[in-house]
Interface confidence: medium
């Protein structure tokens, strides 16, 4: 009996036309939602004038349906038993699952001012930037609608830059009508233990963002893992959102709609400083902001964001060192709400439920040449928003799963 089940599973999890896995892989049957909470700055003037702590108040959720589009350009390569594809991006606002509309206003850091002053530290260029910032009536903070902040707006300061640069700015600009990839993953035909594991991303086996092994593209994209998952395994996966590979470890057994699943979580060790976890040494790319690589819980992904000083963390700086959040008031980290987990059905390796949580922050530094940043006395890693991307297997799919997979085994 067990051998037959193993044989069936091995056949059905292969990523090729006609298998259960392939159908669900091309276009997920699970509804995936991305909820955003925006950090509304309550005291912009005091920060700018007195270098006070930034007081934030989170507002949300603002919910979008995401990942509803089928994978594109799916191409099987029988030579190396891989399948390549693009994952198109799309987001549809869900008013009924949101606290307000896309026209809601927020006071947030001026993204262009913070980024430009960081990218161009040259004193002469900063003098030029200062005149453009002043001329455009830009400041350290700005008021933007949710739609503008997430999906893009024309920045008045960038519109004055003396050579033709893109003047559109947004936390996720551009998003709609773009695609992530090309991903090339193993289809499992030759070895089921490699199914869904990424061979190359954008044509390469490494990212060119990090030194040494930190730069490797490891594991799957977390939507599924090779079958017959063990609790002792460390599940590696790559997330283009955070520009790195990361891993999850077993936490507990969970019953999901009658299906026994393993809950794997991202451990605090994955966010530790190299002092606490030497494996993370190559994720520390600069010495000043990281206080000589002793800070933890934030990841500088500027190399992956065209030099913009973007830092990724867990929401509310969960698992981050105290120095990171000491300049911010109003944060309440909470493991239950703010950690990331994956609920994996161990026989198939399919992720049947997940919650991916992350926070996007921007570094802003004092600059004696830029008037609106002149009075700052310290660096700030400013939280802009955090997101919770979730998906749960539907009732019908769960029923089918119970009868075809777990039912047969039990």
């Amino acid at each position: 009996g067990d051998m037959l089940i193993q044989k069936t599973i091995k056949k059905e999890v292969v990523l090729e036309e006609g298998t259960i896995a392939f159908k669900n892989w091309v276009k997920t049957g699970t509804e995936i939602y991305r909820q955003f909470w925006i950090f509304d700055v309550q005291n912009p003037q005091e920060v700018m004038m007195n270098s006070s702590n930034i007081q934030v108040k989170q507002r949300g959720p603002y919910t979008y349906r995401v990942r509803f589009l089928a994978k594109e350009n799916i191409t099987q390569d029988p030579k190396d038993n891989t399948v390549s594809f693009l994952q198109p991006n799309g987001a549809i606002f869900e008013p009924s699952l949101s606290v307000g509309t896309e026209a809601d206003n927020f006071t947030v850091l001026n993204l262009a001012v913070a980024a430009a002053s960081h990218i161009y530290p040259n004193p002469f260029v900063q003098v030029v930037l200062n005149s453009l910032i002043n001329k455009s009536k830009s400041s350290m903070f700005q008021v933007r609608t949710l739609r503008e902040l997430l999906w893009g707006y024309t920045d008045p300061f960038l519109s004055l830059v003396p050579y033709p640069v893109s003047t559109r700015v947004g936390m996720f600009y551009p998003y709609n009508n773009t695609a992530d990839g090309v991903y090339k993953v193993f289809n499992g035909k030759d070895s089921i233990s490699k199914v869904a594991i990424i061979d190359t991303y954008k044509g390469k086996r490494n990212l060119s963002y990090w030194e040494s092994y930190c730069d490797m593209i490891n594991g799957t994209d977390a939507a599924s893992f090779p079958p017959f998952v063990e609790k002792s395994q460390v599940l590696q996966f790559f997330s283009s959102d955070i520009c790195r590979s990361i891993y999850a470890v077993f936490e507990s057994d969970v019953n999901l709609k009658g299906i026994p699943v393993y809950r794997f979580v991202l451990p605090s060790k994955a966010f530790a400083s190299p002092v606490q976890n030497p494996d993370n040494h190559c994720f520390c790319t600069e010495k000043i902001i990281s206080k000589n690589c002793t800070s933890y819980g934030v990841l500088d992904i500027s190399k992956c964001k065209e030099g913009k000083p973007v830092y990724i963390s867990l929401p509310h700086f969960l698992y981050a060192s105290p120095d990171v959040s000491e300049t911010i008031d109003g944060l309440n980290p909470n493991e239950e709400e703010h950690r990331t987990y994956l609920d994996i059905e161990p026989i198939t390796g399919f992720t049947l439920q997940f919650a991916k949580r992350l926070q996007v922050n921007l570094l802003v530094k004092p600059s004696n040449k830029i008037q609106v940043l002149k009075r700052l006395k310290r660096n700030y890693i400013v939280p802009i928003l955090w997101l919770n991307e979730t998906g749960t297997i539907g009732d019908e799919k769960a029923k089918m799963f119970r009868s075809q997979v777990t039912g047969k085994i039990n």
């Epitope: 161009y120 040259n122 050579y163 033709p164």
Partner: antibody
């Protein structure tokens, strides 16, 4: 202080090749679009080529008169920009400057194409 | 190609005089992308005015720039001996990038 230093100029015969180099210091080279501009008494200042950033996939633009003959490239790890010039003509003679245009210019390197 | 025509080609002025030189573009361009460079004999060009009217770092306040569309100008309110140089306008609004042929300012 930002500094740009061009090298590689000299005398070359028509139809020949030459590679110019430019090393930058004093600014974050990898954040700037880089250009080559040349100057001759006959034509004055003439833009030659531009190369953008890694994030722009190192996009390049060329003046019509050098398209297909000249290639601009950069190595951010060495803070350097290069100009590979093939099939040189007498009208390519001049002082070649490398510059992020809105910053400082180098002192230039002289190329003479003559038989 | 957006051709920039500078006039006059050569001008002469006495210290204290006000001088204006012009730069005309063959097609309209955004004032954000029109710049002026100063080049003294034997030296490389230096950015002098950017985006039509903004003085580069260290440029004396007697210099000013103005214009829009196809017509731009550089003015020195009270010329000094150190202003003797050739001034070039340049556009960055489209490829190819182009320079004017220059206006040489001589001081009497």
């Amino acid at each position: 202080e930002e500094k740009l230093e061009e090298s590689g100029g000299g005398l070359v015969q028509p139809g020949g090749s030459m590679k110019l180099s430019c090393v930058a210091s004093g600014f974050t080279f990898s954040n700037y679009w880089m250009n080559w501009v040349r100057q001759s008494p006959e034509k004055g200042l003439e833009w030659v080529a531009e190369i953008r950033l890694k994030s722009n996939n190192y996009a390049t633009h060329y003046a019509e008169s050098v398209k297909g003959r000249f290639t601009i490239s950069r190595d951010d790890s060495k803070s350097s920009v290069y100009l590979q010039m093939n099939n040189l003509r007498a009208e390519d003679t001049g002082i070649y400057y490398c510059t992020p245009l809105l910053l400082r210019w180098g002192q230039g390197t002289t190329l003479t194409v003559s038989s | 190609e957006n051709v920039l025509t500078q006039s006059p080609a050569i001008m002469s002025a006495s210290p204290g005089e006000k001088v204006t030189m012009t730069c005309r573009a063959s097609s309209s361009l955004s004032s954000t992308y029109l710049h002026w460079y100063q080049q003294k004999s034997g030296a490389s060009p230096k950015l002098w005015i950017y985006s039509t009217s903004n003085l580069a770092s260290g440029v004396p306040a007697r210099f000013s720039g103005s214009g829009s569309g196809t017509s731009y100008s550089l003015t020195i309110s009270s010329v000094e001996a150190e202003d003797a140089a050739t001034y070039y306008c340049q556009q960055y609004s489209g490829y190819p990038l182009t320079f004017g042929s220059g206006t040489k300012l001589e001081i009497k």
